[in-house]
Each structure stands twice: as C-alpha cells, then as structure tokens.
C-alpha cells in the first residue's frame, strides 16, 4: 500500500478509549497545560493538578492502518487536539461527542501515536511528517522537529 | 517494566503443527499491537504479520497467511502464534515484539525435525 | 511491498574509523528505523523515525536520510559496535526489513 499521506477516501471509525486521563510531559519535564480556550502550552510545574489530563480514542481504518490511529480529548470534555499547519498552534475544537467516523479534512482530528520506549509521538495524519511539539515561549503545534520537542512521556493514574 | 517471555526451544516433526508463545507483562497489554517476526539460522528478519489483541484483528505478510495464526489470550496477556504443516523451511528463531518495536522477546528457537 | 536494500552487506572498520552504512527503500517512506542485532541476542531498537537514538544507544551513531534514501553512522568506530544492523519501515504494510549489513572490526 502507499506511505501515509492525506487520503480524504479513507475513513477512519472510532473504536474505543484506550488511555485515560493521562499528563504529556514533554522532554523538558514540561507539562502540557491550557494557555486560553483555543490553545496549549507547556511549563514546568510543581503542582500536576495544573496539567491537562488527556483521554486518547483509538480509530481505525478499511486499509489495514500500519500505525495506532488516535484522537486526544481533554478529560470531563468535549475539547479535541486539531491540526493546522508546521509551526501553527494546534487547535481546541468543541464538538458535542466523539467523532463515529472521520475521513477527508476532518483528519486533522487524528493522529498516528508511536512509542519509542517510555517516549510518545503523535504526527498528524493530515501532515505525516509533522509531529505534535513544544516550543519554547510559543504555544503547542505542529513541527517537523528540533528545535521544538516532538517527544512525550505519558503520566498514567494521576487523577 | 515491559517484558515479553518466549520459551527458549520448541521441537517438532515435519507436517506437524506448533504454537508458539509470548507472555507480556508490565503494561496493559490490549493497548497495543503485537508483531511477530522470523528469522533463519544466519539469515535476516522476516514480519510475519501483526495482531491487535484487544478485538483479535490480526493482518498477515501475504508470505505467511495461509501457514501463520496469530491468537491471544486477554486472561493471561499472551499472544500466541501456530504454524501449520511445518517443513525444514520453518525452522527459525522467532521473535514477538510490542507495537513500536520497542520491546522484544528472547524468541523461541523452532526446530523442525524428524 | 516496499522493497528495503541495505549496502553493504559486509563491511569492516578500524577502531576510530568512521562508518555509513545505507537503506534503499524501493518507494519513498516517511521514516526509516534501525535495529542493532549481535549473535544470539534479539534486535535491539537502534535509531527510530530515522534520527532519534534509541535509549542507551551512544552518541557516536546517526541517522539521516529521507523519501527513499537513509543512512546510519558511526561517527568513530569501536569495538562493541560490530553487529549486524537492520533497516524497517513501518510506513506501509506490510512492515518490511532490510537485508541487513554486518560489521565487523578490522
């Protein structure tokens, strides 16, 4: 089959939350944080009750999908991460539940989730080449890498 | 910390069948994908196919579909692979390793003799 | 399937040489991953998403590369790196590995 790209014939059906209410901390120690409604950031906290906590939903697809396909929630909300484009911020989006299907532009809800170990990475499946990232004084976007963070450890059991 | 137990040798007769094992601990075992992987004496490694063991949705090289079942058992966290009709080709270390390829079996070495 | 050639099959180096070994993939992939294998051992995750070491792996190796070009280095050589390495994709299904290249110590 053909390396992933944006395919908007493929449709992706939500099939189950697979991780709840988790804390991403980015390679600094930083925590992923709400900087306003629309935005994320990271910083080092002391308290971790700070920290977003996040629910991923696993999603598949009809072409055999070489990677776990997810979408990431804020916990207790109907806020879903959303791409845009390299070096945007990505996005809050309020829908009223999780999506049963998604395919053409809505791909940008979803992201491909591999783990490395104890590190995470999500790259978009709308942009495959783009990972979710921190940045320095900047808010959470997309990125190809350095000099942005595209690595997270998952913190489980925080609640 | 994420461990994947293989026994070290399985020995068997051609024609025969043998299923393989792999005990996973450490982590919550239907959240990820297991893969299993082949490799002959002297020889390189060989995906033999994939299977999500929370709803047993398994895909397959088209190489081994019709010789390789991959199962699991949710109760016990093991994923198991069977060979079928085995002839001297089989005869390989093979390996189970988590999704992300981050975390491997010792593998079970698979003698296939009469 | 995407076809993933390694060159070359067989190499040597002197301790403190400098080392490039290469993965051709037969169509182009996002990422390229790379396993380290020594004899009765299983693979070891080496290098992932084509440039980030895996855990313990020392600084002296990279990896570069895109589309359907990639290389691992070993910026000087030493004496626990002889090993056959592997090249994977999983950019595709299904996964695929390389032949593998084997290094050796001169």
């Known amino acids: 089959s053909a390396p992933f790209s944006f395919l908007s014939n493929v449709k992706y059906n939500f099939m189950r939350i697979i991780k709840y209410e988790f804390i991403l901390n980015d390679a600094l120690n930083q925590s992923i944080i709400r900087a306003n409604d629309q935005y994320l950031t990271a910083a080092a906290l002391h308290n971790l009750d700070e920290a977003v906590k996040f629910d991923m939903g696993a999603y598949k697809s009809s072409k055999d999908d070489a990677k776990i396909t997810v979408i990431l929630r804020i916990s207790k909300t109907q806020l879903y991460v959303t791409a845009q484009d390299e070096d945007q911020p990505v996005l809050l989006k309020e829908m009223p539940e999780i999506p049963k299907t998604i395919t053409g532009s809505e791909t940008n809800l979803l992201f491909f989730w591999e783990t490395h170990g104890t590190k995470n990475y999500f790259t978009s499946v709308a942009h495959p080449n783009l990972f979710i990232a921190t940045k320095q004084d900047y808010w959470v976007c997309l990125a190809g890498g350095p000099p942005s963070i595209t690595d997270f450890q998952i913190l489980e059991n925080q609640a | 910390q994420v461990q994947l137990q293989q026994p070290g040798a399985e020995l068997v007769r051609p024609g025969a069948s043998v299923k393989l094992s792999c005990k996973a601990s450490g982590y919550t075992f239907t959240t990820y994908w297991m893969n299993w992987v082949k490799q002959r004496p002297e020889q390189g490694l060989e995906w033999i196919g994939r299977?999500?063991?929370?709803?047993?949705?398994?895909l397959y090289s088209q190489k081994f579909k019709d010789t390789a079942i991959l199962t699991v058992d949710k109760s016990s966290s093991t994923a198991y692979m069977q060979l079928s009709s085995l002839t001297s080709e089989d005869s390989a270390v093979y390996y189970c390793?988590?999704?992300?390829?981050?975390?491997w079996g010792q593998g079970t070495t698979l003698t296939v003799s009469s | 399937q995407i076809v993933l050639t390694q060159s070359p099959a067989l190499m040597s180096a002197s301790p403190g040489e400098k080392v490039t070994m290469t993965c051709s993939a037969s169509?182009?992939?996002?990422?390229m991953y790379w396993y380290q294998q020594k004899p009765r051992s299983s693979p070891k995750p080496w290098i992932y998403l084509t440039s980030n070491l895996a855990s313990g792996v020392p600084a002296r190796f990279s990896g570069s590369g895109s589309g359907t070009s990639y290389s691992l280095t070993i910026s000087s050589m030493e004496a626990e790196d002889a090993a056959t390495y592997y090249c994977?994709?999983?950019?595709?299904?299904?996964?695929?590995f390389g032949g593998g290249t084997k290094l050796e110590m001169k």
């Open positions: 994977q994709q999983w950019n595709s299904n299904p996964y695929t």
């Open positions: 299977i999500d063991p929370y709803d047993s949705e398994t």
């Open positions: 169509s182009s992939v996002n990422y």
């Open positions: 390793a988590r999704y992300g390829f981050d975390y």
